[in-house]
C-alpha cells in the first residue's frame, strides 16, 4: 500500500522559518503534489504550493521555495514574518496524486518538544484520504 510521509522542521537560523519535506512511498508515477497548511487542500487547508513534474511549480506566500528533491519527494521552505507566518502547532499536509494508485494525503506538524534545527525523522504519517 502506498504511503505518504511528512517532516516539518523549524530552521535554527530563522526561528519563524519552516521547512516541510514530503515523500511518496509507492511504485506509481507522480502527476501532482499539493502542499497546504491548516488542513487538507480544500477542506479547511490553504494551498501553499503545487508541483507538477513537467508543468512546473506554483507557490504562494508565505512559501519561499518549493522544489523537487527526488522523483517522489519535495521540500518547501516557508518565510516566517508577517500575519501569514506559520506557528509551531501549524499542521501541514501533502497530497500526492499518482498513477495508477490515485491520491494519497498525509499531514504533520512540528514535534512538540523539538529544538530549532531539529526534527523528527521522516516517518510515514497517517494517511488521511485515498481517492
Amino acid at each position: 500500500t502506498p504511503e505518504v510521509w511528512v517532516q516539518v522542521r523549524m530552521e535554527a537560523t530563522e526561528l519563524s522559518s519552516f521547512t516541510i519535506r514530503c515523500g511518496f512511498l509507492g511504485s506509481g508515477s507522480i502527476s501532482l503534489v499539493t502542499v497546504s497548511w491548516g488542513g487538507p487542500n480544500g477542506a479547511g487547508g490553504t494551498t501553499l504550493a503545487v508541483l507538477h513534474p513537467e508543468r512546473g511549480i506554483r507557490q504562494w506566500a508565505p512559501a519561499r521555495q518549493a522544489r523537487w528533491e527526488t522523483q517522489s519527494s519535495i521540500s518547501l521552505i516557508l518565510e516566517g514574518s508577517g500575519a501569514s507566518s506559520p506557528c509551531a502547532n501549524t499542521t501541514f499536509c501533502c497530497k500526492f496524486a499518482s498513477f495508477p494508485e490515485g491520491s494519497w494525503e498525509a499531514c504533520g506538524s512540528l514535534p512538540p518538544s523539538s529544538d530549532p534545527g531539529l526534527s523528527a525523522p521522516p516517518t510515514p504519517a497517517p494517511i488521511l484520504r485515498a481517492d
Partner: nanobody, 127 residues
Framework: EVQLVESGGGLVQPGGSLRLSCVAS??????????MAWFRQAPGKGLEAVAG???????TYADSVKGRFTISRDNAGFSLYLQMNSLRAEDTAVYYC???????????????????WGQGTMVTVSS
Amino acid sequence: EVQLVESGGGLVQPGGSLRLSCVASASGFTYRPYCMAWFRQAPGKGLEAVAGIDIFGGTTYADSVKGRFTISRDNAGFSLYLQMNSLRAEDTAVYYCAAGDSPDGRCPPLGQGLNYWGQGTMVTVSS
C-alpha cells in the same frame, strides 16, 4: 464552505466588450482551485463550456469564443476573469463560474469534477 461570486454582467451592444469576474472564497481558509472555468446557458438552451484555466495557467476555449474571449486568473490563484470582446447576439446568456480540483491539476473536460458553482451573471448583447 466554498462560494463563487460572479460580477461584471450587463447589457452591451454587438461588437462591444465586457469583463466578467469571479472570486472563490471560503470561511477560515483560502481555496485555490486547480481548475476554474466559465460556462454559459443561453435562454432555452443547455449549459455550454466557454473557457477554463488551470493552476499553472493552461487555458482551453470553446471554438465559438476563440480569438474573442480571454480567460485569466490572478496571481493569488482564487480570482477568475473573462475578457469578452467582439460580442455577438448569440453570446447572450447567463455566465457561470465553476471551480474544482483534478488529479493532475488540469481542467477536466466538460466540467467534470468542478464541484463548486456560482449563481451566474447575465450578459445581454443587443442593440
